[in-house]
């Protein structure tokens, strides 16, 4: 560690005095101190001499000697006071810049340590400090404003009591800069705009930041618009607002509008699209197929997308039949607005009953007129099967009726023994009926088909089974001939004699 001579922490001299500061180290040494006049530097190997033969108040400050070659980076310091009765302060800098919440050192150095008891910090014109200003004083360094705030950006003077009167330093301007987290925050309202030619429109671009130094502009299709700017300050943020007012829009006003704001941290931009139309419009669409098939007992949501300008004046869901005159419950209808001009309307149909199949229409109205979108809802049913023994044209015939939706396929099985359902091991014969006769096929109803199996002689120790299936499920009916007559077995049901 270097050594300074004189070996005292502080040295007090009068103006005009000769001061010699000598530093000795193991290797070469360097002096560092406040920039001030009249010093002469003389270096000789491992020692360096700093001297003046005419000390002034401006030489007041801390002089530090370092040994650049020392790996431990040791240093020695001495503080010099040049006590000038007319100049109690040596100001090292007239402008101090810090960020908010940093400590701000106002470098007014006291030229006479005796004056320390009577020092104070004031604002220019002798005004007291702002409320909640937390500061401390060091005669070697000056006043420190702790955790400086933006509003403490002021001009300050250091005051010392000399002979009963206050003597001020020259001013020190403190600039406390806001810590800017990023580019200004932006809003562009509306996010989308549609107007009929001749109508009025307004687009508002606003930007805000904790710091006043930022720019904002509005551009239309890459052309910067000249709009007067309104400025405001609230919630500790500066706000700049650009409002574009169009009294009568035309097609040339349409297009992309961008709100752009920038500061030292960068740039933010947000865009919107302005559409100018000739007249009112109302478009209905659905992402779903308009023809819907759902299994009975399940639920369905019908969704309609509406694009409209001007806004809707009315809308509703209507059941058009054919089964009943019931109407959808209002509580099952739901409307959500995606944005200003697009809406989604949903009709919830939970646990569908047979009587709820049919046509559902969504109707909407705006100044452009009425529009409707109709869904056709068909219910799917698993097949229901029944078999009877009859004579047709003198021949014994098993008649199987199957009812369901979609149209069921029919298969006949003949198996040994009496059983409710033929299993693989018992099957003697299988007949597929590729074209059963369609007995009824009305929209939104079940399809009923009939299949005939001509049997010359009924084998008494056998079972005849009619099976029907579709995409929903399957059904079957077992027919067991017995000596007393023919018996039929619906699955898991009682025997009966036709």
């Amino acid at each position: 560690i270097p050594v300074i001579e004189p070996s005292v922490p502080e040295l007090v001299v009068k103006p005009g005095a000769t001061v010699t500061l000598r530093c000795v180290g193991n290797g070469s040494v360097e002096w560092d101190g406040p920039p001030s006049p009249h010093w002469t530097l003389y270096s000789d190997g491992s020692s360096s001499i700093l001297s003046t033969n005419n000390a002034t108040f401006q030489n007041t400050g801390t002089y530090r000697c370092t040994e650049p070659g020392d790996p431990l980076g040791g240093s020695a310091a001495i503080h010099l006071y040049v006590k000038d009765p007319a100049r109690p302060w040596n100001v090292l800098a007239q402008e101090v810049v810090v960020f908010e919440d940093q400590d701000a050192l106002l470098p007014c150095l006291l030229t006479d340590p005796v004056l320390e008891a009577g020092v104070s910090l004031v604002r220019v014109r002798g005004r007291p400090l702002m409320r909640h200003t937390n500061y401390s004083f060091s005669p070697w360094h000056g006043f420190t404003i702790h955790r400086a705030k933006f509003i403490q950006s002021q001009d300050y003077q250091c005051s010392a009591l000399m002979g009963g009167r206050k003597v001020m330093s020259i001013s020190i301007r403190l600039k406390v800069q806001k810590v800017i987290p990023g580019p200004p925050a932006l809003t562009l309202v509306p996010a989308e705009l549609v107007r009929i030619r001749g109508e009025a429109a307004q687009i508002v671009c606003s930007a805000s930041s904790v710091d006043v130094n930022f720019d904002v502009f509005l551009q239309h299709n890459n052309t910067k618009l000249a709009i007067p700017q309104q400025s405001d300050f609230h919630n500790n943020r500066y706000q700049k607002v650009l409002t574009l007012n169009l009294d009568q829009v035309d097609f040339q006003h349409a297009g992309n509008y961008s709100c752009v704001a920038s500061n030292v941290q960068g740039k933010h931009s947000t865009s919107m699209f302005f559409r100018v139309v000739e007249s009112a419009y109302l478009n209905l669409s659905s992402e779903q197929n308009l023809i819907q098939e759902v299994t009975v007992g399940e639920g369905l949501n019908l969704k309609v997308m509406v694009e409209a300008y001007p806004g809707l004046q009315g809308f509703n869901w209507t059941y058009l039949g054919p089964f009943s005159d019931h109407q959808p419950e209002p509580k099952l209808a739901n409307a959500t607005t995606k944005d200003t001009y697009r809406h989604t309307f949903t009709l919830s149909l939970p646990r569908l009953k047979p009587s709820e199949a049919g046509r559902y229409s969504f109707l909407a109205r705006n100044p452009g007129g009425w529009r409707a979108l109709t869904f056709e809802l068909t219910l799917r049913y698993p097949p229901e099967v029944s078999v009877i023994w009859t004579f047709i044209n003198g021949s014994g015939t098993l008649l199987c009726a199957a009812s369901g939706y979609p149209q069921p396929n029919v298969t006949w099985l003949q198996c040994s023994g009496h059983t409710d359902r033929c299993d693989e091991a018992q099957v003697l014969q299988v007949w597929d009926d590729p074209y059963p006769e369609v007995l009824s096929q009305e929209p939104f109803h079940k399809v009923t088909v009939q299949s005939l199996l001509t049997v010359e002689t009924l084998e008494h120790n056998q079972t005849y089974e009619c099976r029907a299936h579709n995409s929903v499920g399957s059904g079957s009916w077992a027919f067991i001939p017995i000596s007393a007559g023919a018996h039929t077995h619906p699955p898991d049901e009682f025997l009966f004699t036709p």
Epitope: Q94, G126, R127, M130, I151, D155, R173, F233
Partner: antibody, heavy 117, light 111 residues
């Protein structure tokens, strides 16, 4: 947008009193020193009083002891209580905000005080 | 108190010309390199408007034809090229020591 709106002016007899108000908006009122400046018809500007953020008050010799400046930060309001009014106090009174180191950066539109018998 | 003296009392110029207004202080209104002098413009029936602060800094929204200079006791307001709307009364003000004082004003009129 910074706005200062004065009110309370009017006709008053010599020796009478009047209280002027200044409503501030668009900035953090409590963070700024505020002032009153007056201007007699056809004359120049004259600083009348000032108040700091800490409530410290300042007056020129011409009004000291007669005028009292005050502020109510919660209401964003500045006041000037004028007592023992004289004919020489007749003027338009302006409320002004002092920037950090900018001088008086915003002014109100003024309120007329007439002292006459 | 610091007395500010403006000159000339009245200045008659034509649009497009250069205007130079002077303000002299009875004692220094500077502190180091910081000067506490402002210039204001006032039109009939209106409040004063800040043009220049700190002797040479232009206030927000003021056209760059307005400029200020000077330090210590001598200060100048220059309008590089007069526009019709610039004809008004101009005041200097010192705000570095109490009481704050204004100059008596310079009337800038159309020739």
């Amino acid at each position: 947008e910074v706005q200062l709106v004065e009110s309370g002016g009017g006709l008053v007899q010599p020796g009478g009193s009047l209280r002027l108000s200044c409503a501030a908006s668009g900035f953090t009122f409590s963070s700024y020193d505020m002032h009153w400046v007056r201007q007699a018809t056809g004359k120049g500007l004259e600083w009348v009083s000032g108040i700091g953020t800490a409530g410290d008050t300042y007056y020129p010799g011409s009004v000291k002891g007669r005028f009292n400046i005050s502020r109510e930060n919660a209401k964003n309001s500045l006041y000037l209580q004028m007592n023992s009014l004289r004919a020489g106090d007749t003027a338009v009174y302006y409320c002004a905000r002092e920037g950090s180191w900018y001088g008086f950066d915003y002014w109100g539109q003024g309120t007329l005080v007439t002292v006459s018998s | 108190e610091i007395v500010l003296t403006q000159s000339p009392g009245t200045l008659s110029l034509s649009p497009g010309e250069r205007a130079t207004l002077s303000c002299r202080a009875s004692q220094s209104v500077s502190s180091g390199y910081l000067a506490y002098l402002a210039w204001y413009q006032q039109k009939p029936g209106q409040a004063p408007r800040l043009l220049i602060y700190g002797a040479s800094s232009t206030a927000t929204g003021i056209p760059d034809r307005f400029s200020g200079s000077g330090s210590g006791t001598d200060f100048t307001l220059t309008i590089s090229r007069l526009e019709p709307e610039d004809f008004a009364v101009y005041y200097c003000q010192q705000y570095g020591s109490s009481p704050i004082t204004f100059g008596q004003g310079t009337r800038l009129e159309i020739k």
